[in-house]
């Protein structure tokens, strides 16, 4: 029995920050759970994590390579990501197991998230000669 | 059959770590359905919950030992590993693995313990 | 953390004697009608051996005269006919919420 998420195909950044919903086909405020984004079309790398219950507010990590912190209500993780690079652009995927009480729950693997940073190029107005 | 053998125990100085392995056999670490624990019975007592490892790679570690406790595992070698840092004489123990199933986190298999003494 | 604490500590008892094991939890380990608690037969030595799971179902090739009942906080473990291999110590685990913690044991000697 797996979860279902739903995640904006596409988010397209030109300020370096990015925020990441997923919203999941169960209550999480029922279990304890552990939420997590992964970056790479095989999930390669974990960019951010937290766990969280009904009792207490989850403290979100980052991966070294990223600055993260994250929020949830009772069916969606919202993961906000900055300072991000050109570099970061990739297909990212939200994941979610629920631990306990037991049984142990997961979600089915999402079409993901294309997060496209833009590059910043400085706009300098050429101005014609004067005749 | 599904089997645990646990390694790595014996003599540890105070103040040093210990690296036990949880060799599996009869079913895979990464495929979902089971995850596995390590626990830990001090001699004469009973049984303490160290922490445990989910299909996926997570973990979850007792609070009381989070700070020196990694529990990590290869695919490749289908072998779970238990990392204990900063030992003292009150770590010393009979370390088992033992297996739990998705449903009711039961523990249906245990490997046979490897000691682990800690004294100088 | 769920504390659990079995009664008796220790009993002595005769081959054929029916002998009941109690365990409480400090807060329920119930959730959507199921009990997450588990017993355990330890003998000198070995590891654990599962006995009962999920409150009162019985392990694969654990005998009959063994059975658990109960639910929310309390629970029993029951031996109908003690035979000579069952005298161990046993122990109760709650699973439904981390970290997962024992029962402090209860020894079942010979009389």
């Known amino acids: 029995n797996k979860i279902l998420v739903k995640q904006s195909p596409l988010l397209v950044v030109d300020s370096n920050e990015v925020s990441l919903s997923c919203r999941y086909s169960y209550n999480l405020l029922a279990k304890e759970f552990r939420a997590s984004l992964y970056k790479g079309v095989n999930s390669d790398v974990e960019v951010c994590v937290g766990n969280g219950n009904f009792t207490y507010q989850p403290q979100f990590r980052s991966n070294a390579e990223f600055n993260c912190d994250g929020d949830f209500d009772n069916e969606t993780v919202t993961f906000r990501l900055w300072n991000l690079h050109v570099n970061h652009t990739d297909i990212y995927f939200c994941k979610i197991e629920f631990m306990y009480p037991p049984p142990y729950l997961d979600n089915e693997r999402s079409n993901g998230t294309i997060i496209h940073i833009k590059e910043k190029h400085l706009c300098h107005t050429q101005s014609s000669p004067k005749l | 059959e599904v089997q645990l053998v646990e390694s790595g125990g014996g003599l540890v100085q105070p103040g040093g770590s210990l690296r036990l392995s949880c060799a599996a056999s009869?079913?895979?670490?990464?495929?979902?359905?089971?995850?596995v624990s390590w626990i830990r019975q001090a001699p004469g007592k009973g049984l303490e919950w160290i922490g445990e490892?989910?299909?996926?790679?997570?973990?979850y570690y007792s609070p009381s030992l989070k700070s020196r406790v990694t529990i990590s595992r290869d695919n490749s070698k289908n072998t779970l590993y238990l990392q204990l840092n900063s030992l003292r004489a009150e770590d010393t123990a009979v370390y088992y693995c033992?297996?739990?199933?998705?449903?009711?986190?039961?523990?249906?298999?245990w490997g046979q313990g490897t000691l682990v003494t800690v004294s100088s | 953390d769920i504390q659990l604490t079995q009664s008796p500590s220790s009993l002595s008892a005769s081959v054929g004697d029916r002998v009941t094991i109690t365990c409480r939890a400090s807060?329920?380990?119930?959730?959507?009608?199921?009990?997450?608690l588990h017993w355990y037969q330890q003998k000198p030595g070995k590891a654990p051996k599962l006995l009962i799971y999920?409150?009162?179902s019985l392990q694969s090739g654990v005998p009959s005269r063994f059975s658990g009942s109960g639910s929310g906080t309390d629970f029993t473990l029951t031996i109908s006919s003690l035979q000579p291999e069952d005298f161990a110590t046993y122990y109760c685990?709650?699973?439904?919420?981390?970290?997962?913690?024992f029962g402090q044991g209860t020894k079942v000697e010979i009389k």
């Open positions: 490892i989910y299909h996926s790679g997570s973990t």
């Open positions: 685990q709650q699973s439904y919420r981390s970290p997962r913690t």
């Open positions: 999920a409150a009162s």
């Open positions: 009869g079913f895979s670490l990464s495929t979902s359905g089971v995850g």
């Open positions: 807060q329920s380990v119930d959730f959507h009608g199921i009990s997450f």
């Open positions: 033992a297996r739990y199933g998705y449903y009711y986190y039961d523990f249906d298999y």
